[in-house]
């Protein structure tokens, strides 16, 4: 069993190294920014909206293209729930330093958890996406 788990870990590791998770990161960041642009998630901002809508984000075409490419990448992890979780954790880790607000971080996590389902894939049952609040600057 240990040998099998070790092989599984190695297989997952090489899958993660091969995968291009950038389209997933681009899709998620566009999605949460589009939601914020639409609804103004900062209730304390004078105009109820910290930012004004951007035509680039409103178009949505770029985001659906990213989503399609993202789903293709996540499909590689369909048969390994633990590895799917590690892929989601990697996405969270890669973007955490871009999210300098509690709501932004929570919304990103919510969207990230829903991602496998959006792609028609099984979502991992237990997957801890916690990172240090505000993220660390990674260059």
């Amino acid at each position: 069993r240990q040998q099998w788990e070790l092989q599984g870990d190695r297989r997952c590791q090489s899958q993660l190294e091969r995968a291009n998770l950038r389209p997933c990161e681009q899709h998620l960041m566009q999605k949460i920014q589009r939601d914020e642009d639409s609804y103004g998630r900062d209730p304390y901002s004078p105009s109820q909206d910290p930012y004004s809508p951007s035509p680039y984000d409103r178009r949505g075409a770029g985001s659906s293209q990213h989503q399609e490419r993202c789903c293709n990448e996540l499909n590689e992890f369909e048969n390994n729930q633990r590895c799917m979780c590690e892929a989601l954790q990697q996405i969270m880790e890669n973007q955490s330093d871009r999210l300098q607000g509690r709501q932004q971080e929570q919304q990103f996590k919510r969207e990230l958890r829903n991602l496998p389902q959006q792609c028609g894939l099984r979502a991992p049952q237990r997957c801890d996406l916690e990172v240090e609040s505000g993220g660390r600057d990674r260059y």
Epitope: R22, E25, Q26, L28, M29, Q30, Q33, E36, D42, P43, Y44, S45, P50, Y51, S54, Y56, H66, N94, Q95, R98, L99, Q100, G101, R102, Q103, Q104, E132, S133, G134, G135, R136, D137, Y139
Partner: antibody
């Protein structure tokens, strides 16, 4: 109404210390990264330090690393900047600013003047 | 450390005329998520700075549409389509890819 009010500025000799405060009201202070930025006539705007909403992560400009310490008191909605070993080149107006959540500086205080002079 | 270089450092303008400021970065400001982490701020005389443009091209709330930002990677531009008297002040670009740093500022004044 959004308000960030800095205090604690003044005239101080080189090598001495000063502690700046920034009292926040009308904004979700505890939900966002907070920053200190300074403006001097010769250097313009210079980002100084930032602290994540949970206070776990702290970031500093190279020019102040090891001398300045940023902290926050969530119960009092207050941001602090402890400035030690002050130098003449630290003379500036110091502003506190709240992050937008996406690394932009969205809300700014009116600033407090720090003068380091012998 | 990322260095931002603005030009020109001083810009005399005529009300009603267009104006543009350039900001060049010592390295690309595109994050792996596809966004350019470059903002523009204006500090009017006697006031605190204010956010104009974030992520290179998105206009902040309440900012007049005569202001626009463009560019990607290392070269960015802030354009004012028709300058108004109230637009005078010092304009700064700021990168937020690696911690945060400002350009040296461009002073815009009426001719």
């Amino acid at each position: 109404q959004v308000q960030l009010v800095e205090s604690g500025g003044g005239v101080v000799q080189p090598g001495r210390s000063l502690r700046l405060s920034c009292a926040a009201s009308g904004i979700a202070f505890n939900d966002y990264t907070m920053h200190w930025v300074r403006r001097s006539p010769d250097k313009g705007l210079e980002w100084v330090a930032a602290i994540s909403y949970g206070g776990t992560n702290k970031y500093y400009a190279d020019s102040v690393k090891g001398r300045f310490t940023i902290s926050r008191d969530s119960s009092k909605n207050t941001l602090f900047l402890q400035m030690d070993s002050l130098r003449v080149e630290d003379t500036a107006v110091y502003y506190c600013a709240r992050d937008s959540g996406y690394r932009s500086l969205l809300h700014w205080g009116q600033g407090t003047l720090v003068t380091v002079s012998s | 450390e990322i260095v931002l270089t603005q030009s020109p450092l001083s810009l005399p303008v005529t009300p009603g005329e267009p104006a543009s400021i350039s900001c060049r970065s010592s390295q690309s400001l595109v994050h792996r998520n596809g966004y350019n982490y470059l903002d523009w701020y204006l500090q009017k005389p006697g006031q605190s700075p204010q956010l104009l443009i974030y992520m290179a091209s998105k206009r902040a709330s309440g900012v007049p549409d005569r202001f626009s930002g463009s560019g990607s990677g290392t070269d960015f531009t802030l354009k004012i389509s028709r300058v108004e008297a109230e637009d005078v002040g010092v304009y700064y670009c700021m990168q937020a890819l690696q911690t945060w740093t400002f350009g040296q500022g461009t002073k815009v004044e009426i001719k």
